[in-house]
């Protein structure tokens, strides 16, 4: 997290706000609900209280405007700048302005007013932009999904550094951003994508370019807003320029940033029986046209060319790949080796000799 220079903050805990005007995109009630909910994000974790005024001057004046709207920080039409807010202080201090050239919504379409407002009110209270891609105060908008919003831990630490904690946090689960060099790090899924490596963990993935040591961390939804926050398995089919992503009993086919029409589909359409509730890992072999799927303690082989499960499957992981354990969290193939991830450990397995060559920490893939 980051706070503004000179640690700008309100010297009182009872703050007022006023909605000066409204966007035509939503009903008045939807706008009011979005702003109330956005303030609650911050009051839940601090001693701050927010009261709405219907007229007069409030600490935080909220308005919608377009282009030059009276503060010498003009908006720029659709997209780009969505909103801005001033840090705590007199006059403009604390005020939040929203660009009415955006389409404001209470869903995943356009820009979600609640999410943008919660971010802007963070500025109104003294938080600057965070470098943590999981933080609400990260400067890039990402729709985080329909489920109940949980303020990330980085934002909680930031706001409490200014105002301290509140009496009781009604939602004490604050998601942390994974640390790639945590020795206990386990991974959810790994796939290549057009020469890069995508390494999934929780609602994030690391993006590793070839010949590059520093992996970039992204929210999965910043790449693919329609995907679930967390995924179970992934693999690339390079000759078709597709990657396949699995979560529970569903899977998606993606071409770059775009989901193919007709997806998600059910994994039963690949030939899995209904007892299989999720795929834990998957890896595709371009030379043979086969894909291995791991679920529980079993491995399945799928023939991509004929689009059918191979006979004699499923088999036990321990029988086909002795020594790697009875489960696979994530897997990928490179230069004749399969890399199996099981908890914080990865196994380098030689396809030809059918032997484990090396055992390494899972996060050595991330250059830790």
């Amino acid at each position: 997290y980051n706070v503004f220079p000179r640690t700008l903050k309100w010297s009182k805990t009872n703050l007022t706000y006023r909605i000066v005007n409204y966007t035509p995109d939503l009903t008045h009630s939807e706008v009011e609900k979005a702003f109330k909910k956005a303030f609650k994000v911050w009051s839940d974790v601090t001693p701050l209280n927010f009261t709405r005024l219907h007229d007069g001057t409030a600490d935080i004046m909220i308005s919608f405007g377009t282009k030059e709207h009276g503060d010498f920080y003009p908006f720029d039409g659709p997209s780009g700048l969505l909103a801005h807010a001033f840090p705590p202080g007199p006059n403009y201090g604390g005020d939040a302005h929203f660009d009415d050239d955006e389409t404001w919504t209470s869903s995943s379409k356009g820009y979600n007013l609640f999410l943008v407002a919660a971010h802007e009110f963070g500025h109104s209270l003294g938080l600057d932009h965070s470098k943590d891609p999981g933080a609400l105060m990260f400067p890039i908008y990402t729709y985080t999904g329909k489920s109940h919003f949980m303020l990330p831990d980085d934002d909680v630490q930031g706001i409490q550094s200014l105002y301290g904690p509140g009496d009781e946090d009604p939602n004490p689960r604050h998601p942390k951003t994974p640390d790639k060099c945590d020795p206990s790090l386990s991974l959810d899924a790994i796939t290549s994508l057009r020469g890069e490596t995508m390494i999934f963990k929780d609602r994030f993935f690391w993006r590793l370019h070839p010949q590059q040591v520093d992996a970039e961390l992204f929210l999965t939804k910043s790449f693919w807003p329609e995907l679930p926050n967390r995924i179970d398995a992934a693999y690339e089919h390079p000759s078709r320029d597709l990657i396949f992503i699995f979560r529970g009993r569903k899977y998606w086919a993606l071409n770059g940033y775009d989901i193919l029409e007709g997806y998600p589909q059910k994994i039963s359409e690949l030939g899995f029986p209904k007892e299989v509730k999720k795929i834990s890992a998957a890896v595709h072999f371009e030379d043979t046209g086969k894909t291995l799927f791991f679920s529980g303690n079993q491995v399945w082989s799928y023939d991509d060319t004929n689009q059918i499960m191979d006979k004699d499957y499923p088999r036990l992981i321990e029988e086909d790949f002795p020594g790697i354990g009875d489960k696979v969290d994530a897997v990928y193939e490179k230069n004749g080796y399969i890399y199996f991830f099981n908890g914080p450990i990865q196994f380098e397995y030689n396809i030809w000799s059918k032997r484990i060559v090396r055992v390494m920490p899972a996060n050595s893939l991330l250059w830790c």
Epitope: P78, F218, D241, N255, G256, Y257, D258, L260, E261
Partner: nanobody, 114 residues
Framework: EVQLVESGGGSVQAGGSLRLSCAAS????????MNWYRQAPGKQREFVAG???????NYAVSVRGRFTISRDNAEGTGYLQMNSLKPEDTAVYYC????????WGLGTQVTVSS
């Protein structure tokens, strides 16, 4: 419905630069990812570069560090800046919005001679 028209192709010596443009008609351009693909004679069409709605970029390994993709949603235009061109970059370059099942331009020829 989005119509895409590429421009900026041409002939250039190895090591030279070109800037391709992709003009989109229709106000929905900003809702789609924008991609460049290319097809060399006798070869399959291949992905070159892509930029998401949120302006996250992605490049084929063969062009990374030489090509830069960008977009201007207000103008409804996408760009591909191609530097340090090589003879193997010779191809017809296609602009795409929305991926394989999305919208395609008719292409612009790029020829790089040694």
């Amino acid at each position: 419905e989005v119509q895409l028209v590429e421009s900026g192709g041409g002939s250039v010596q190895a090591g030279g630069s070109l800037r391709l443009s992709c003009a989109a008609s229709g106000s929905t351009f900003s809702r789609y990812s924008m991609n460049w693909y290319r097809q060399a004679p006798g070869k399959q069409r291949e992905f070159v570069a892509g930029i998401s709605v949120g302006r996250i970029t992605n490049y084929a390994v063969s062009v990374r560090g030489r090509f830069t993709i960008s977009r201007d949603n207000a103008e409804g235009t996408g760009y591909l800046q191609m530097n340090s061109l090589k003879p193997e970059d010779t191809a017809v370059y296609y602009c795409n919005a929305g991926g394989l099942q999305g919208y395609w331009g008719l292409g612009t020829q790029v020829t790089v001679s040694s």
